[in-house]
Interface confidence: low
Amino acid sequence: AQEVQQSPHCTTVPVGASVNITCSTSGGLRGIYLRQLGPQPQDIIYYEDGVVPTTDRRFRGRIDFSGSQDNLTITMHRLQLSDTGTYTCQAITEVNVYGSGTLVLVTEEQSQGWHRCSDAPPRASALPAPPTGSALPDPQTASALPDPPAASALP
């Protein structure tokens, strides 16, 4: 059966830093999503070989891709406290398949010790709460910021 290998399981990074998430499959998929889990899951990117990747407006200008849809590395730049959360890869196949998830903990530089990653894969039902004031954005407002000019906006 098709599986999605996802790494890392967890990473703690300071505000402004970058993180790599890798989604690997055995092939035979149509495309791959990266989804941020939470009370209201949000699709972050969609990647399909031969097609311009699409990125949620909250992350536009902060996402890079390398590799192919079978072995895709997604780099999220200039991380903000509100980016804290679990991100899971979803492979679009005849039956959609999910990765184990990556818990991204974005912390203030002086508070690196607040949350540390364990070796266990993250579970959406057992996530540590993000630091006060950095809860995941309300989906009703997360995309309400102006977008870059049309000439530079991704499709």
């Epitope: 495309g31 999503y33 699709d43 969609y46 979803q90 959609n96 309400a144 977008d147 049309a150």
Partner: antibody
Framework: EVQLVESGGGLVQPGGSLRLSCAAS????????MSWVRQAPGKGLEWVSA????????YYADSVKGRFTISRDNSKNTLYLQMNSLRAEDTAVYYC????????????????WGQGTLVTVSS | QSALTQPPSASGSPGQSVTISCTGT?????????VSWYQQHPGKAPKLMIY???KRPSGVPDRFSGSKSGNTASLTVSGLQADDEADYYC??????????FGGGTKLTVL
């Protein structure tokens, strides 16, 4: 060839429910966001709801929030709109439409539309 | 009441150009590059003509072009043809996960 075929419309009393379906073919359904747009008789277009390709993100117009639910079954290439607590002002032709680019709903109603299904809310 | 304001009618002779405006605010048209234009013939489903201000879907002739200045978006139809006679609607992202439409403009080819 891209085809979208809506069904499920009809006459319903105020306060009632209906479930609209939109059968899609001719494209990789799971890769595209989908929308519902309605048009009251003799009136203009009104966006109702949208859903991303995986179904992970949903969006609703204020006028239907809490009453309508959009969903999709990518294994059946079908889009749905569950409409509850219907009101007379919900009377319209309901169109489903496909986003022009794969991935996210990028705030465009769609490049391919079905022919619509009429919903009439009346006692 | 429509979120976006369009003139109720516009007209032009075959071969001429006509421009239809779509006026909003800094919270919709002026704040985002998610303006689309749709053509609808009587009794038919709408057809997307322009999206993201100026992008044309495949199959839409380059006689149709979109632009935006401040809080007003415009659709220009050049080299008017009889089949261009239809209703035209604009839409724009309006913030807070809402998509607003204009009231529509009836284009008449004289």
């Amino acid at each position: 060839e891209v085809q979208l075929v809506e069904s499920g419309g009809g006459l319903v009393q105020p306060g009632g429910s209906l479930r609209l379906s939109c059968a899609a073919s001719g494209f990789t359904f799971s890769s595209y966001a989908m929308s519902w747009v309605r048009q009251a008789p003799g009136k203009g277009l009104e966006w109702v709801s949208a859903i991303s390709g995986s179904g992970g993100s949903t969006y609703y117009a204020d006028s239907v929030k809490g009453r309508f639910t959009i969903s999709r079954d990518n294994s059946k290439n079908t889009l749905y709109l569950q409409m509850n607590s219907l009101r007379a002002e919900d009377t319209a032709v309901y169109y489903c439409a496909k986003d022009p680019d794969p991935g996210y709903f990028d705030w465009v109603a769609g490049d391919y539309w079905g022919q619509g299904t009429l919903v009439t809310v009346s006692s | 009441q429509s979120a976006l304001t369009q003139p109720p009618s516009a007209s032009g002779s075959p071969g001429q150009s006509v421009t239809i405006s779509c006026t909003g605010t800094s919270s919709d048209v002026g704040g985002y590059n998610y303006v689309s234009w749709y053509q609808q013939h009587p009794g038919k489903a709408p057809k997307l003509m322009i999206y993201e201000v100026r992008k044309r879907p495949s199959g839409v002739p380059d006689r149709f072009s979109g632009s935006k200045s401040g809080n007003t978006a415009s659709l220009t139809v050049s080299g008017l043809q009889a089949d261009d006679e239809a209703d035209y609607y604009c839409s724009s992202y309006a913030g807070s996960n809402n998509l607003g439409f204009g009231g529509g403009t009836k284009l008449t080819v004289l």
